[in-house]
């Protein structure tokens, strides 16, 4: 049931979580870590904050957006296929057993093969026919039709935009966000 | 606001069944626990069970295992609690709560022939 | 499973007067105790979390201190719609565990 989200082995994957602060710079402690959400606190610890400021983080792992504005979506740079799998955003509210916990499913894919433009023939072979793209929830997928039916140059520019758009996309996708107070 | 509203009185026989339903409001149904806690008549207060609507994963005081049986509906936002082989001893107020730091105003269960 | 031993089982107090009701766990439990106020025919209060850490609008007169296996739950001053049943819980493993209940009555 976990919220998938798509990266290529090299680029950085973005994991969005968010929270509205009940008054600005009133923040609430938030751990992000690998696995599942367990009942209490985060497994496997990679990045966690406090009331005023990131206070723990491993390599790789950082915060891009605004964590004192409730943004407390997860960078991890330069993605290998070990990064692929399940993470855990728990948003550390006050209370007894009171947190909110968010599980969201990294899937990371092999770095696409680059074209050389000047051979049609090995583009072919190594273009793949599925080119997934991010829309505003789980990934979708968008199949190219017959590769012949479409030269270079149309190629070229659905790649770009299709680059484009998910690199939109990432800067705001449907990440989990809830209000506190 | 959070809110849960749980279901009617229930009056039924022994070895009989039942399914008592909680419905959340004012927050994310699947971030957030659910515990079950029941309170028998002038006693104090048991911890039935667990559930993360998230996953549907659970946990239960040993003493519930087999009695209780906890479940969720994503698409309705709204907790259940099942109990089985009812007796006379299990006639008790059942809460459900959100964490334990907002509760339902609890069911009455009557088991009585 | 952690026994939670609550004390006393019940008491009389006077308006204005300072009450402590107190919580002994069996085994260490890392601060993860709550307190809760019921009063007849009602849910369940939360009123600390933490072992010392006051719900938000919850009276300052209630204030919740402890740690290791020794807990206390302390009203500075007694009111009238302070009466009713006190519980305290252990939530640092499973099965989470209820104190057996602290009645506070009027003297």
């Known amino acids: 049931s976990e919220v998938e989200y798509r990266a290529e082995v090299g680029q950085n994957a973005y994991l969005p979580c968010f929270y509205t602060p009940a008054a600005p710079g009133n923040l609430v402690p938030v751990c992000w870590g690998k696995g599942a959400c367990p009942v209490f606190e985060c497994g496997n610890v990679v990045l966690r904050t406090d009331e005023r400021d990131v206070n723990y983080w491993t390599s790789r792992y950082w915060l891009n957006g605004d964590f004192r504005k409730g943004d407390v979506s997860l960078t991890i740079e330069n993605v290998t296929l070990a990064d692929s799998g399940i993470y855990c955003c728990r948003i550390q509210i006050p209370g007894i057993m009171n947190d909110e916990k968010f599980n969201l499913k990294l899937v990371i894919k092999p770095a696409k093969v680059t074209p050389a433009p000047t051979r049609q023939r090995d583009f072919t072979a190594a273009f793949p026919r599925m080119l997934t793209t991010r829309g505003h929830g789980p990934a979708e997928t968008q199949t190219l039709g017959s590769l012949p039916d479409i030269n270079l140059t149309q190629i070229s520019t659905l790649a770009n935009e299709l680059r484009d758009s998910r690199l939109a996309n990432d800067l705001r996708d449907s990440g989990a966000t809830i209000r506190i107070g | 606001q959070v809110q849960l509203q749980q279901s009617g009185a229930e009056l039924v026989k022994p070895g009989a069944s039942v399914k008592l339903s909680c419905k959340a409001s004012g927050y994310t149904f699947t971030s957030s626990d659910i515990n079950w806690v029941r309170q028998r008549p002038e006693q104090g207060l048991e911890w039935i069970g667990w559930i993360f609507p998230g996953d549907g994963s659970t946990k239960y005081n040993e003493k519930f295992k087999g009695k209780a049986t906890l479940t969720t509906d994503k698409s309705s936002s709204t907790a259940y609690m099942q109990l089985s082989r009812l007796t006379s001893e299990d006639s008790a107020v059942y809460f459900c709560?959100?964490?334990?730091?907002?509760w339902g105003q609890g069911t009455t269960l009557t088991v009585s022939s | 499973d952690i026994k939670m031993t609550q004390s006393p089982s019940s008491m009389y107090a006077s308006l204005g007067e300072r009450v402590t009701i107190t919580c002994k766990a069996s085994?260490?439990?890392?601060?993860?105790l709550g307190w809760f106020q019921q009063k007849p025919g009602k849910s369940p209060k939360t009123l600390i979390y933490?072992?010392?850490r006051l719900v938000d609008g919850v009276p300052s007169r209630f204030s919740g201190s402890g740690s290791g296996q020794d807990y206390s739950l302390t009203i500075s001053s007694l009111e009238y719609e302070d009466m009713g049943i006190y519980y305290c819980l252990q939530y640092d493993e499973f099965p989470l565990t209820f104190g057996a209940g602290t009645k506070l009555e009027l003297k």
């Open positions: 933490r072992a010392d």
């Open positions: 709560a959100r964490g334990l730091d907002y």
């Open positions: 085994q260490d439990i890392n601060s993860y």
